[in-house]
Amino acid sequence: EINGSANYEMFIFHNGGVQILCKYPDIVQQFKMQLLKGGQILCDLTKTKGSGNTVSIKSLKFCHSQLSNNSVSFFLYNLDHSHANYYFCNLSIFDPPPFKVTLTGGYLHIYESQLCCQLK
């Protein structure tokens, strides 16, 4: 298992919400990506292929997510101060072998300017 800080901008703020970007190498074809808040699984997305190369996308913990060819984005809405925490992208690579797990993360700072529906 590889642990480290994300070497890219992991948090993108917009409209009182945040897009959390979890990247994976282009070569990875089948994987599970989990978003952890501290040690708690908030979201997950699994991409696999069957014996005829049919792709299946599965989410056990439902979050609004977006898949591209080298990243999974998870979206959190209605930010408040309780969202401030360490967030980790926990990537399990099934294909290509060998099976590997990598963990990258960063701290989500919440500032007043990023909060939704501020009271004036």
Epitope: G50, S51, G52, S56, P96, P97
Partner: antibody, heavy 117, light 111 residues
């Protein structure tokens, strides 16, 4: 240890129905696509069909499409093959197999289905 | 559908022989740098066992005398020094598209 155990095979008349089961253990069943593969006596291997983790995607070989259905019960760790309108050419040993992301890495011992009047 | 062919259909061999089994696909199995080609061994009365995936990667526990090679449409399984426990049928299979199909098999028999 991964184990797949098929059951439900036997003698069935042409046009009849039969339901095969495959009990899985030793791994997280819901994490894997599962397949059925058959082998006629003295012949080679023929893919029958597959099902994704939660049964949302099911594919069949042209030779069985419209006659066979595949389902799974993740709570019971069991895979099923419902065979309807069977023909003599469906006579075979039926194997359930785990698709381990890039190959069939585990197979059951097989169950023999004989279609004869 | 992709058609898989194998040659020879059967082969008589002796212990220590180098054995070569060929597999050909009706279209290229190469995608994103990987060949979607698998080899299985099946002994009499048993279920098939995985030997090689992605054309050349040995499955866990498979002896290193089994070597997979080839790319595109032409593939080879080589047993560098045949052992009597290697008797049985050998099948190639593609998983490039649906339906995944198997070759007709190659039977290895004792000379």
């Amino acid at each position: 240890e991964v184990q797949l155990v098929e059951s439900g095979g036997g003698l069935v008349k042409p046009g009849g129905s039969l339901k095969l089961s495959c009990a899985a253990s030793g791994f997280t069943f819901s994490d894997y696509w599962m397949d059925w593969v058959r082998q006629a006596p003295g012949k080679g291997l023929e893919w029958v069909g597959n099902i994704d983790h939660d049964g949302n995607i099911i594919n069949f070989a042209p030779s069985v499409k419209g006659r066979f259905t595949i389902s799974r019960d993740n709570a019971k760790n069991t895979l099923y093959l419902q065979m309807n309108s069977v023909k003599s050419e469906d006579t075979a040993t039926y194997y359930c197999a785990r698709w381990g992301h890039y190959a069939f890495d585990s197979w059951g011992q097989g169950t023999l289905v004989t279609v004869s009047s | 559908d992709i058609v898989m062919t194998q040659s020879p259909s059967s082969l008589a061999v002796s212990a220590g022989d180098k054995v070569t089994i060929n597999c050909k696909s009706s279209q290229s199995l190469l995608s994103s740098g990987y060949n979607y080609l698998i080899w299985y061994q099946q002994k009499t009365g048993q279920a098939p066992k995985l030997l090689i995936f992605y054309a050349s990667t040995r499955h866990t526990g498979v002896p290193d005398r089994f070597i997979g090679s080839g790319s595109g449409t032409d593939f080879t399984l080589t047993i560098t020094s045949f052992q009597t426990e290697d008797l049985g049928d050998y099948y190639c299979q593609h998983h490039y598209s649906s339906p995944p199909t198997f070759g007709p098999g190659t039977k290895l028999e004792i000379k």
